[in-house]
């Protein structure tokens, strides 16, 4: 659900963190219409997720901690 590298909507699925290698934050005030977390998967897919949802917050914190510990 993205266009010109902007997410236009969110996935309906809950992704397991074991499939995710990183993420990018999309901010609505920086040229895109909505705030989003773009998850990057092991299969080189980009998935747009709602940053307000609990499962997304957990994965963002998990990945952020991994980067800090590297």
């Amino acid at each position: 659900a993205s266009n010109f590298d902007c997410c236009l909507g969110y996935t309906d699925r809950i992704l397991h963190p074991k499939f995710i290698v990183g993420f990018t934050r999309q901010l609505a005030n920086e040229g895109c219409d909505i705030n989003a977390i773009i998850f990057h998967t092991k299969k080189k897919l980009s998935v747009c997720a709602n940053p307000k949802q609990t499962w997304v917050k957990y994965i963002v914190r998990l990945l952020s901690k991994k980067v800090k510990n590297m």
């Epitope: 609990t54 499962w55 957990y58």
Partner: antibody, heavy 120, light 110 residues
Framework: EVQLVESGAEVKKPGSSVKVSCKAS????????ISWVRQAPGQGLEWMGG????????NYAQKFQGRVTITADESTSTAYMELSSLGSEDTAVYYC?????????????WGKGTLVTVSS | QSVLTQPPSVSAAPGQKVTISCSGS????????VSWYQQHPGKAPKLMIY???KRPSGVPDRFSGSKSGNSASLDISGLQSEDEADYYC???????????FGTGTKLTVL
């Protein structure tokens, strides 16, 4: 009707650990996270951390990092919170609460709470 | 130390309306939804409002929530004696990656 049933009251010595359980009676954890919240006598609510059982991934509040361990057993729909190096300031009621994975962190179902008393 | 600030106490007579405020910052209330919890003495908290202004089933429509910028409010109209309780606001904080509760407000129905 789903209920969160917590283990019974505990009295612990300073420096020891306590492990509190929380079972989803009449339901499962499949689309929920479980948070742990404590309340010292006469004080406010304090989020300690939470876990998404289907992920096996826990988040901890910075204040409790390194001292709290939250786990879950999907097969029995039971979550656990273990707090170590107990001090008198850890005397509190410990609640487990449920939040939808697709919601925005609202805790829509709570256990009745487990009183943990730390005393020498 | 919570970064969501509420007045320690509010009071009003039965039938009146009361507003409880909750002040935060961009990283919590400003960017996330707010929920409100009611707690009677010796009881577990109960969700009263979520997603700023939605009510779970069973919560009377006398309870309503709103948000403006980095602050949120809980309005209780037509006060009843059973509304006397502690009320807590809460929101996720993106900077801390933690769920925050407000300092709590004791509502007294005079």
């Amino acid at each position: 009707e789903v209920q969160l049933v917590e283990s019974g009251a505990e009295v612990k010595k300073p420096g020891s650990s306590v492990k509190v359980s929380c079972k989803a009676s009449g339901g499962t954890f499949s689309s929920y996270a479980i948070s742990w919240v404590r309340q010292a006598p006469g004080q406010g609510l304090e989020w300690m951390g939470g876990i998404i059982p289907i992920f096996g991934t826990a988040n901890y509040a910075q204040k409790f990092q390194g001292r709290v361990t939250i786990t879950a057993d999907e097969s029995t729909s039971t979550a656990y919170m273990e707090l170590s190096s107990l001090g008198s300031e850890d005397t509190a009621v410990y609640y487990c609460a449920r939040e939808s994975l697709t919601g925005d962190s609202e805790l829509d179902l709570w256990g009745k709470g487990t009183l943990v008393t730390v005393s020498s | 130390q919570s970064v969501l600030t509420q007045p320690p106490s509010v009071s009003a007579a039965p039938g009146q309306k009361v507003t409880i405020s909750c002040s935060g910052s961009t990283s919590n209330i400003g960017n996330n939804y707010v929920s409100w919890y009611q707690q009677h003495p010796g009881k577990a908290p109960k969700l009263m409002i979520y997603d700023v202004s939605k009510r779970p089933s069973g919560v009377p429509d006398r309870f309503s929530g709103s948000k403006s910028g980095n602050s949120a409010s809980l309005d209780i109209s037509g006060l009843q004696s059973e509304d006397e309780a502690d009320y807590y606001c809460a929101a996720w904080d993106d900077s801390l990656s933690e769920f925050l509760f407000g300092t709590g407000t004791k509502l007294t129905v005079l």
